[in-house]
């Protein structure tokens, strides 16, 4: 059962796993949710009746029954983890805590103009978990405007104390706001020879990399595969760090793989969701339950629905035994990973999918697409929406992309002459315009947010957000697309598609069926040569064939330029402008979304 509200002046008795320090009960709940075993917590707020050394303690708890006895205690705030809930979860915490000093290892001290600048510094520093900033009113003159960057083993403060005229806060890496590089490559036959901060068992290097990503201290990792010569180290995932933030030594070793934490790409690739099945593999751990199941998929479902289950092993049924049902072993451990991994016993193992809700919805794999052809199939571009105007008549106005459950990203130039959001309707999950009838459900638009530097499409800033009146329930036919990570600026996208209901040539009609075209990206230098009379800025991105023939056109505006990278689709561009349509040596010009990620997050995450 999902319980989101906090219980004031209430303490849960027993079930303690560990104690951490958090600046608020709300953040304690987030820490509990991300902890592999925590189901409940008790937080102690500051209070004259409470010993100051206990202020800000967040006691993480577990219980076989998923609940614990309640005791009345002033200043105690208790609650449940969000593990039991089905909604999206985020560790992003933008709150600034006034007059609180969050203790940790102070490894960097510098002058900053504001707490915001200090927070940005922390976000862009590979080691930083949180910061404390001494304001200009701080009593000690030499400490005024000092920004202390801090880290700890757990990522949470080792203590929190009251201190006048300071403010503290967390790194915004988990809000996708870091400018740090996003290195997705996994290096085969490589060992990073740096200090280990932890080790866990993992079935493959991808899981190892994802574990590294959500481990607070891990910056890179080395994984020993099941063919690794030393038997005791097979399937071992070593979580590592270094002072520089990069591996100091790389050793060539066969059957080992190494890679980096995906902290700076976590909003555009899954880091919590281990959805694969591992055949002929047994995961060992504390047994939670043994249940009969028809298949390993059914076993995974059972594990996902059992809130304490972290991973499972399924042993298929012996012929004609137990109505063809096999045994499903639901398991857990102290850190969420198997205590040992064995091969050759015929089991099929995997992980709970409960943690998938901690990943951005946009990373979910979508239907395989039909290659070739110009008409799309249903569910092929589930983030594509058709934006309709109802004035003077109801018709398709522009394309757009779902980027959040209340947000559509589109082009600013679509709203020329649109005086009110009331005349707009957003239709999602649409393949054919002819499907849109009087009773077709749509999303009303609450607000149109146009970039305040926008003047005209050709001069840039052609970007707008639509805030919907109601939230989008994600399904196979309507779900978000990932924004590119700022750390991905140097990625060369090779699989890019433009989609829309727009014209197929300069004089044409809105298409009934959603059209698609694969289009190569063009460098800005090349694009500038083709548009001598315009300034192609770094905030624009171009795409097109030298010979022309495929391009976006009238009616496609605001729609996505979607590029697939590492099996995840990213919204690389917004259809903006061009000279004619599909003309030779006249590429289409798109708004370069990566350059507006901060703007998008600022507008969509504003309270």
């Amino acid at each position: 059962e999902c319980v989101t509200q906090l219980l004031k002046d209430t303490c849960f008795e027993g079930g303690d796993i560990t104690t951490v320090f958090t600046p608020s009960a709300k953040y304690c709940q987030v820490v509990c949710t991300y902890h592999p075993r925590c189901l409940l917590f008790t937080f102690t707020a500051e209070s004259p009746s409470e010993d100051p050394t206990r202020w800000f303690t967040c006691v993480l708890k577990d219980s076989v029954t998923e609940t614990l006895p309640r005791v009345n205690r002033t200043a105690a705030i208790s609650g449940y983890s969000f593990k039991q809930c089905s909604h999206q979860i985020s560790a992003c915490n933008k709150d600034i805590y006034v007059d609180l000093d969050m203790k940790g290892i102070n490894y960097n001290s510098s002058v900053a103009k504001s707490a915001q600048e200090c927070q940005e510094r922390c976000t862009d520093d590979v080691h930083c978990h949180f910061f404390t900033y001494a304001t200009r009113q701080f009593p000690s003159l030499e400490h005024r405007n000092i920004c202390l960057l801090k880290h700890t083993q757990t990522g949470t403060p080792t203590r929190i104390t009251k201190l006048d005229k300071v403010v503290s806060g967390f790194s915004l890496k988990s809000c996708a706001l870091s400018n740090l590089a996003c290195i997705r490559d996994i290096f085969p036959n490589t060992v990073f020879a740096d200090s280990n901060i932890d080790s866990v068992m993992a079935p493959d290097a991808f899981v190892c990399g994802r574990i590294c990503t959500h481990h607070p201290g891990c910056l890179f990792f080395t994984f020993f595969s099941q063919e690794w010569p030393k038997e005791s180290q097979r399937n071992l995932c070593l979580l590592k760090t270094s002072e520089s933030g990069l591996p100091s030594t790389r050793i060539k070793k066969s059957k080992a793989l190494s890679g980096f934490s995906l902290q700076s790409c976590r909003h555009s690739i899954p880091v919590f969701c281990h959805s694969s099945f591992y055949h002929d593999t047994d995961f060992l751990g504390e047994e939670l339950d043994i249940v009969a199941a028809k298949s390993h998929e059914a076993c995974q479902k059972l594990c996902t629905n059992a809130v304490r289950c972290q991973f499972f092993t399924y042993t298929p049924a012996q012929a004609s035994c137990n109505e063809g049902k096999g045994k499903c072993y639901l398991k857990l451990s102290s850190n969420g990973s198997p205590t040992k991994i064995l091969h050759g016993r015929g089991g099929i193992s995997g992980y709970t999918l409960r943690l998938c809700k901690m990943d951005n919805e946009c990373t979910t794999k979508i239907k395989p697409r039909i290659v070739g052809g110009t008409a799309s199939v249903r569910g092929e571009w589930p983030w594509q929406v058709t934006l309709h105007t109802t004035s003077p008549t109801q018709r398709h106005l522009c394309g757009g992309s779902i980027i959040g459950n209340q947000w559509i990203l589109t082009a600013a130039h679509c709203f020329y002459g649109v005086e009110s959001p009331k005349i707009l309707r957003v239709y999602s999950g649409i393949l054919n315009q002819s499907e849109i009838k009087e009773d077709t459900s749509f999303f009303g638009v609450q607000e149109i947010i146009i970039h305040d530097q926008y003047k005209m499409a050709e001069s840039g800033y052609d970007i707008a957000l639509l805030k919907l009146e109601t939230t989008v329930n994600y399904t196979d036919s309507q779900r978000p697309i990932c924004l590119p990570s700022k750390g991905d600026r140097n990625v060369i996208y090779t699989d890019c598609w433009v989609t829309g209901w727009g014209y197929r040539k300069l004089r044409d009609k809105i298409q009934n069926t959603l059209q698609k075209a694969k289009i190569p990206l063009v460098t800005n230098e090349e694009c500038q040569k083709r548009y001598r009379g315009h300034k192609i800025t770094h905030k624009m991105i171009c795409a097109g064939y030298r010979e022309g023939g495929k391009d976006a056109c009238k009616g496609d505006s605001g729609g996505p330029l979607s590029c697939k990278h590492n099996e995840v689709w990213h919204l690389v561009g917004i259809t903006s402008w061009g000279e004619g349509c599909a003309q030779r040596e006249r590429p289409g010009v798109y708004t370069n979304v990566v350059e507006y990620v901060d703007w998008i997050l600022e507008k969509t995450q504003a309270v």
Epitope: H388, T390, S391, P392, T393, Q394, R395, H396, Q433, S434, I436, K437, E438, W501, R504, R507, D508, K509, I510, N512
Partner: antibody
């Protein structure tokens, strides 16, 4: 079931006026663009005029522009065509028609039974 | 303003297939959607094809529409011809660069033999 019922047709002298009405039922009238299409005896179809949902925008064929006025009353789910300065070439059966909900193209999804207008001295 | 030209009459025998063409005089046939209407004597028209090739749910799948850019014309095809298909058929399109200006073809009388 969509129903469009025209009325108001009849015999009228050239230069005089006539007002046609079309009462709609079976759909949300205020959500649709409506039109009049006419058909001269033993001749083809000819679009006359269209009006958007709230009546704020009207469209006419050139030969009736300035003589005909299209209006609607959404509360009464009724479409009107006020025809002034009638000419003999306006003689036709006048059909009330409903455009599609989504105007990504222009066509006539539903038609009424028609009302005959005869302009003759 | 363009015109849409249809043959005055077309005939076909019972259970055969017929095609009625509709040629656009200027501008590309593909620049705007073509619709088709069936009209029995003394009855109002019925929309049988819209948006080039889309069929309303209540219309028989024996009716299909297409456009051919090489001949700059649209076509209505009726397969497995029935006696009740005998009627006048009108094509209709518009100029997509002008707000509202539907244009009808002159109509084709279909006789079922």
């Amino acid at each position: 079931e969509v129903q469009l019922v025209e009325s108001g047709g009849g015999l009228v002298q050239p230069g005089r006026s006539l007002r046609l009405s079309c009462t709609a039922s079976g759909f949300t009238f205020s959500k649709y663009v409506m039109a009049w299409v006419r058909q001269a005896p033993t001749k083809g179809l000819e679009w006359v005029a269209s009006i958007n949902y709230d009546g704020s925008t009207t469209y006419y064929r050139d030969s009736v522009q300035g003589r005909f006025t299209l209006s609607r009353d959404n509360a009464k789910t009724t479409l009107y065509l006020q025809m002034d300065s009638l000419r003999s070439e306006d003689t036709a059966t006048y059909y009330c028609a409903r455009h599609p909900f989504n105007n990504f193209g222009i066509w006539f999804a539903y038609w009424g039974q028609g009302t005959l207008v005869t302009v003759s001295s | 303003q363009f015109t849409l030209t249809q043959p005055k009459s077309v005939s076909g025998s019972l259970r055969s297939t017929i095609t009625i063409p509709c040629e656009r005089s200027s501008g590309d046939i593909g620049d705007s959607y073509v619709s088709w209407y069936q009209q029995h004597l003394g009855r109002p028209p019925i929309n049988v094809i819209y948006a080039d090739d889309q069929r309303p749910s209540e219309v028989s799948d024996r009716f299909s529409g297409s456009i051919d850019t090489s001949s700059n014309s649209a076509s209505l095809t009726i397969t497995n011809l029935q006696m009740d298909d005998a009627a006048d058929y009108f094509c209709q399109s518009y100029d997509s660069n002008i707000d509202f200006n539907p244009v009808f073809g002159g109509g084709t009388k279909l006789t079922v033999l």
